[in-house]
């Protein structure tokens, strides 16, 4: 996890001090580096990325996505509905995160920095949204079945979900990432 | 024409308050961050505070703080920068300045106003 | 916070000439920009994320760089070009900003 202190954000009057804007900044650039190394070895592995069969395998998952109502856009955006969205989302993300563990042979170290990565992220932007409404977390009887109900699936299945998870991460921290930027 | 007009410079005795508006055109207001940035004279470039869009996070330069507040009125789409016990070296030309959508970058700024702290 | 150090701190060059600005942290950044400031007038972005391209900026201005040292290039220098030029980075707050460099004409 990249280290970046920052002791100069201050909160407006009615919010705590902050955590670091530059660690967010460093800690999503970092997971996205680690999703790039790990789809390099989906891609390599199968031909999933050219694949026009998402859809199958869509079915099945009910990844988190950044909608026009998230307030995450530069159309419409809302900082506190946002920053709300983020981390609902990324707790989302995390039981498939823990479905790519046992998904990888030679970025089996990079698939834990990412799920470990990912959870000081969640740290970093609960305390930003200190003062925010409540964010419900996921239930986990629902996710650990969920996980169950993925690894019970066919092979093909299995890496056609590990490439959706990838690029439906990647493409939910770039949009945080530009979001976040002006917060 | 997207633009930025800064207002509410002057003289002010050391001591003193002044509050500077930026008065934003030609774009949406909403979605952006702004941002003030001061520059003494003949001196280079000194960033002073940033507000985030909808006004819940600030962020201010170790000069500044617990001097200035940064504040917004998103309803007439203008920054203010209110400046409290001013002091000789808070003299500058104080810019506005827009940041860039998904960036950190400053990419439009105001013509400035000129702030002189003096006896 | 970040110090910014630009060399030159001023240069004299003709029109056509390559100018070449760098500007060196002391610990490394984040994010690197570049800025051109003409006498009266307020800051224009140039560069954004060490080597982007503001919107409306001539081609023959670059960014290059990464960690602590950044170069801004004009490739051909013509005479609108004559101004002082800033780096200013993000690494967190405060932004900070280079000395500056002053492009006069020989």
């Known amino acids: 996890v990249p280290p970046g202190e920052d002791s100069k954000d201050v909160a407006a009057p009615h919010r705590q001090p902050l955590t670091s804007s530059e660690r967010i900044d460093k800690q999503i650039r970092y997971i996205l580096d680690g999703i790039s190394a790990l789809r390099k070895e989906t891609c390599n592995k199968s031909n999933m990325c050219e694949s026009s069969k998402e859809a199958l395998a869509e079915n099945n998952l009910n990844l988190p996505k950044m909608a026009e109502k998230d307030g995450c856009f530069q159309s419409g955006f809302n900082e506190e509905t946002c920053l709300v969205k983020i981390i609902t989302g990324l707790l989302e993300f995390e039981v498939y995160l823990e479905y790519l563990q046992n998904r990888f042979e030679s970025s089996e170290e990079q698939a834990r920095a990412v799920q470990m990565s990912t959870k000081v992220l969640i740290q970093f932007l609960q305390k930003k949204a200190k003062n925010l409404d409540a964010i419900t977390t996921p239930d986990p009887t629902t996710n650990a079945s969920l996980l169950t109900k993925l690894q019970a699936q066919n092979q093909w299945l299995q890496d056609m979900t590990t490439h959706l998870i990838l690029r439906s991460f990647k493409e939910f921290l770039q949009s945080s990432l530009r979001a976040l930027r002006q917060m | 024409e997207v633009q930025l007009v800064e207002s509410g410079g002057g003289l002010v005795q050391p001591g003193g308050s002044l509050r500077l508006s930026c008065a934003a055109s030609?774009?949406?207001?909403?979605?952006?961050?702004m941002q003030w940035v001061r520059q003494a004279p003949g001196k280079g470039l000194e960033w002073v505070a940033k507000i985030s869009p909808g006004g819940s996070w600030t962020y201010y330069s170790d000069t500044v703080t617990g001097r200035f507040t940064f504040s917004l009125d998103t309803s007439k789409s203008t920054a203010y920068l209110q400046m409290n016990s001013l002091r000789a070296e808070d003299t500058a030309v104080y810019y506005c300045a827009r940041q860039l959508w998904g960036y950190y970058a400053l990419d439009i700024w105001g013509q400035g106003t000129l702030v002189t702290v003096s006896s | 916070d970040i110090q910014l150090t630009q060399s030159p701190s001023s240069l004299s060059a003709s029109v056509g000439d390559r100018v070449t600005i760098t500007c060196s942290a002391s610990?490394?950044?984040?994010?690197m920009y570049w800025y051109q400031q003409k006498p009266g007038k307020a800051p224009k972005l140039l560069i954004y994320d060490m080597s982007n391209l503001a919107s409306g900026v001539p081609s023959r201005f670059s960014g290059s760089g990464s960690g602590t040292d950044f170069t801004l290039t004009i490739s051909s220098l013509q005479p609108e070009d004559f101004a002082t030029y800033y780096c200013m980075q993000w690494s967190g707050y405060p932004y900070t900003f280079g000395q500056g460099t002053k492009v006069e004409i020989k």
């Open positions: 030609g774009f949406t207001f909403s979605p952006f961050a």
């Open positions: 610990i490394s950044v984040s994010y």
